[in-house]
């Protein structure tokens, strides 16, 4: 038939699977006279024949591997030999099949990897190759880690990446490896090619050794540094020290001190740069990092732990310039007036801040001198030597000294007598009934008032009443403030109220004297009042467990990847269903039951990281109120994206003809992630036949200069094919074109005769 | 007191599709998640999905998705389950449960599907 | 997906004999969310135990469960004519959720 299996001499192009004994013809050329026979030259290896009459096959089966592409060319000849049409070129392309197995470059690889290694970063690859076609499944190849000896508790240390064969620690193998347990571990590792999807792939395997070493970055113990040194600074207190030399070293103050009074050299040690004061901070916390040269983490942060030692720098200070206490005048000998309480900024629970007190004077001193004592380290006074009475002396004043191991101060004590305490105070009511309130009600807010009387001397400690609650409210939920001068009492709010925890509560409140009673006076039913709280239920709003959850995720995850997951719980008890929000790109989806968010659409990094939803927890049932916290997807970089020009070369030209060759320098980018040292990109002509007329050749990482071979250009636009490759795992490739056009120039500018197309190149070189 | 009233049994075809149904009476249906699991003869339980009628979302086995639509009418606090694409493997007992902190208080007494050609 | 795998399959047991069922899940589970079923022949499954070891409401003292973690058991310590039936655990820690096998409990 005409067409497919014959027809005219033309350019063609066949492909041919290789592996294949031959079982039909390629073509079959028809001559036009004068042409009678035909004739083949060209790569035919002795496997290609063409028979005179013009039938084109094949003898043998091809072998992709030894040439994939032969290129023939057939010619017609006359009568006499002589060739009349052609020789026009025919292409076979053979086409792969898997015939060749993987095969590792090693059979035992060996490497070695440092405890505490940050999970996912390669410390070593293995590298297979297959001589089949890479751009097809039968040359792809797929990692994976058939065992790892020895195997602890069934948990992999260690994974490997399956297109690039990259070896790096699990999160597991980062937090558990140690090498005073296990110094060595042995991992089998197959390749499979066909991407290591079907039964029919041919796999090999190979044995890896890894050696796992002592990590030296770690924390030192914590410092101890004395305040006020007069030691010239700065002083040296503790180093770090990163595994390998040249890291570079900094100290992080998390806390943002006004002054952070350390540093760190280049050799890793630390020290503290002026003196401390203990009593302005008692300890540091700061962290200790090591970057490589790009000012990258080598590894995570150490936490620099400095204890600032106290010394005697604080003289004792006094409560107020006067301490007031009453005593009532019947007291007995011995009974406590009150306590005075002085200070010592030093460190507490040492001799630095122990105190010692001792009565230096009494004024008056009637009827006589030591009426008083003081406990000399409680600090406590009592009545010493008689009862006194108001009428003689109404009041009293002790200059005490207070000192500790180094330095005495002075404190001044009134001692006010008062009338004895014999009356009890009597609440107005005994019960004030109920009182329903919102578990919601402020705090500080006074929910109720209520009032005894004291017939005592009036503004004594005899007659002020000090309200207290002595049961129903374990939580301390509620308080009581008096009025000095009515002694009404404020019930307020102090802490939430719960209606879950404590619906109803009997509260009884006990009104008593700042002073104790005379002997034999007690406190009976008329000091006591009681009142019961009720709390209605408001329906609270679901509460998260953090108010933003991140997870982080390669962009080329599988759709269906789970990539997080959030919770919330409500207060009531009630069930929780989960929905987003601001899903703008439709990446995600949660199931409203668990909280769990997965992958529903391809990710990518290029489009923005992270990605910011936020997630509605809204109650089941009650009111169905609900709560907002935020998730942010970071995506992790996979190589996805081809190299491209930087910007549009449009307008490219050199002046024709050319006296000398040329050149022009152009840049290529990616959007992928490049970190630190930028892309590497390499340069190529994009196709074979360009050879002759350019050459390109790198500049750098991202730029290139595409340079003619010779000055023998027409007067025309050239397109320029230019492949440029990323390098990355796995490589990709961009061919991008650079259209270059030779003009006649004026004043160094591309002349074009009126009503030319528009769009003239603007650019010379 | 709570009652799942589920439809009657079905007999279909391959390749064609079926919607049950199931009665919520004695509490708020818009207050708790509606789930269907089924049983095939002889075997376990096997999850297919979850509706929040409140608001209508919803959640699929992954074996499911795509195959099964979960769906509610509130003004007669009925939850429905349609499932596409028949085959002779879906033959089962389909039951509604309500749920309450992911379990499952209440269930229906089943709905019996047989898938035959 | 969560795998659970019930053991045994099968039991056999007498009235007054103290039975124990276990669950094991592929990856650890929250005890929040490891739930128990009875079920008779011919009837739906009925909520026995949730969050490992709460009784349902009406579920007689006798049945009790524990666990953490992976593994999780189900107890009833004096077996009655009633309780010949089919148990199964369910987990909705991560979605979807699934159900053992089931553990057939049957007279000797």
């Known amino acids: 038939q005409e067409g497919k299996f014959s027809g005219p001499l033309k350019p063609m192009t066949f492909s041919i699977y290789e592996g294949q004994e031959p079982s039909q013809i390629i073509f079959q050329f028809k001559a036009n006279p004068p042409a009678v026979t035909f004739e083949l030259t060209g790569e035919t290896d002795n496997i290609f024949v063409i028979e005179r009459e013009g039938l084109l096959y094949y003898n043998r089966a091809l072998d992709r591997e030894t040439r994939s592409t032969h290129n023939l060319q057939v010619a017609a000849l006359d009568a006499n030999g002589i060739i009349v049409e052609g020789p026009v070129p025919i292409t076979i392309k053979v086409k792969d099949i898997n015939d060749n197995r993987p095969t590792f470059l090693q059979s035992k690889y060996e490497g070695s990897v440092r405890q505490n290694s940050r999970p996912g970063k390669p410390f070593l690859y293995v590298n297979a190759t297959d001589l089949d076609d890479p751009a097809t499944p039968n040359g792809q190849l797929y990692y994976q880690i058939v065992i790892q000896l020895p195997m602890i508790n069934n948990v992999m240390y260690f994974q490997i990446n399956n297109k690039t064969g990259a070896i790096s620690l699990t999160r597991e193998g980062s937090q558990e490896l140690n090498p005073a347990k296990n110094p060595s571990y042995n991992l089998v590792i197959s390749v499979k090619d066909m991407g290591g999807q079907s039964e029919n792939s041919f796999s090999d395997t190979t044995s890896v050794d890894i050696i796992v070493t002592e990590n030296i970055w770690k924390a030192p113990k914590p410092v101890e540094m004395v305040e006020n040194s007069t030691d010239p600074h700065p002083i040296k207190i503790t180093q770090v020290r990163w595994n390998d030399p040249g890291a570079q070293y900094s100290l992080v103050d998390k806390e943002k001190l006004p002054r952070f009074p350390f540093s760190i050299d280049q050799e890793g040690d630390i020290y503290v740069t002026q003196p401390l004061d203990r009593e302005e901070k008692d300890a540091y916390v700061f962290y200790a990092v090591a970057k490589d040269e790009y000012g990258k983490p080598l590894s995570y942060p150490l936490e620099i732990h400095v204890k600032v030692k106290d010394i005697n720098d604080n003289p004792p200070t006094c409560p107020s310039p006067v301490t007031v206490f009453e005593v009532q005048e019947n007291e007995r000998l011995g009974n406590s007036i009150g306590t005075l309480t002085a200070h010592d900024r030093d460190e507490e629970n040492t001799a630095n801040s122990f105190l010692n007190y001792r009565i230096v004077e009494q004024t008056p001193k009637l009827p006589m001198d030591g009426l008083f004592l003081i406990q000399t380290y409680a600090g406590m006074l009592q009545l010493a030597k008689q009862s006194l009475k108001k009428q003689d002396t109404p009041q009293y004043n002790l200059t005490i000294e207070v000192s500790d191991k180094d330095f005495k101060t002075l404190c001044f004590v009134q001692i006010n007598v008062i009338d004895i305490n014999d009356q009890i105070p009597i609440f107005e009511k005994s019960d004030y009934g109920n009182l329903t309130l919102a578990e919601d009600t402020n705090i500080g807010s006074t929910i109720l008032t209520i009032q005894a009387t004291d017939a005592d001397e009036p503004f004594t400690g005899s007659s002020k009443i000090l309200y207290h609650i002595i049961k129903g409210d374990s939580e301390g939920r509620l308080g009581v403030d008096t009025d000095p001068h009515t002694n009404t009492g404020y019930v307020i709010i102090k802490k939430p109220l719960d209606f879950e925890t404590a619906a109803v509560s009997n509260i009884v409140f006990k009104a008593e004297n700042p002073e104790p009673l005379v002997f034999g006076v007690k406190y009976n039913a008329s000091s006591f009042a009681k009142f019961t709280l009720i709390v209605t239920d408001v329906n609270e709003a679901p509460q998260f467990s953090q108010h933003v959850f991140q997870a982080k995720v390669s962009e080329d995850v599988a759709i269906g990847t789970k990539v997080g997951n959030v919770t919330a719980k409500d207060p009531e008890g009630l069930d929780i269903s989960y929905s987003l929000r601001g899903d703008t790109r439709g990446w995600l989806k949660i199931d409203h039951v668990t909280g769990e968010i997965f992958s529903v659409a391809p990710l990518d990094r290029e489009a923005g990281s992270p990605y910011r939803v936020q997630v509605v927890a809204t109650e089941v049932g009650g009111s169905s109120l609900s709560s907002v916290s935020e998730f942010h997807l970071i995506l992790m970089d996979v190589n996805d994206n081809p190299p491209r020009l930087a910007k549009d070369y449009t307008g490219l030209f050199f002046c024709h003809p050319l006296s000398a060759p040329g050149s022009l320098i152009f840049e290529a980018t990616d959007d992928d992630q490049h970190l630190f040292r930028g892309p590497h990109f390499t340069f190529s002509l994009g196709s074979g036949s360009l050879q002759n007329d350019w050459e390109v050749s790198k500049i750098n990482g991202t730029h290139a200069r595409l340079s003619t071979r010779h000055t023998e250009f027409e007067e025309r636009e050239y397109v320029v094919l230019i492949r440029i490759n990323d390098g990355g795992r796995p490589p990709l490739e961009g061919i991008v074109s650079l259209p270059v056009t030779f003009c006649s120039c004026v004043e160094g500018s591309c002349f074009r005769p009126a009503g030319h197309q528009t769009g003239i190149p603007t650019v010379g070189m | 007191q709570v009652q799942l009233v589920q439809s009657g049994a079905e007999v279909k075809k391959p390749g064609a599709s079926v919607k049950m149904s199931c009665k919520a009476s004695g509490y708020t249906f818009t207050s708790y998640n509606m789930h269907w699991v089924r049983q095939a003869p002889g075997q376990g339980l096997e999850w297919i999905g979850a509706i929040y009628p409140g608001n209508g979302d919803t959640s699929y086995a992954q074996k499911f998705q795509g195959r099964a639509t979960l769906t509610v009418d509130t003004s007669t606090s009925t939850a429905y389950m349609e499932l596409s694409s028949l085959r002779s493997e879906d033959t089962a007992v389909y039951y509604c449960?309500?749920?309450?902190?992911?379990?499952?208080?209440?269930w229906g007494q089943g709905t019996t599907l047989t898938v035959s050609s | 997906d969560i795998q659970l795998t019930q053991s045994p399959s099968s039991l056999s047991a007498s009235v007054g004999d103290r039975v124990t069922m276990t669950c094991r899940a592929s990856s650890s589970v929250s005890s929040s969310y490891l739930h128990w079923y009875q079920q008779k022949p011919g009837k739906a499954p009925k909520l026995l135990i949730y969050s490992t070891s709460n009784l349902a409401s009406g579920v007689p003292s006798r049945f009790s469960g524990s666990g953490s973690g992976t593994d999780y058991t189900l107890t009833i310590s004096s077996v009655q004519p009633e309780d010949f039936a089919t148990y199964y655990c369910q987990q909705y820690d991560s979605s979807p959720s699934t159900f053992g096998q089931g553990t057939k409990l049957e007279i000797k």
């Open positions: 449960a309500r749920g309450r902190g992911r379990y499952f208080e209440y």
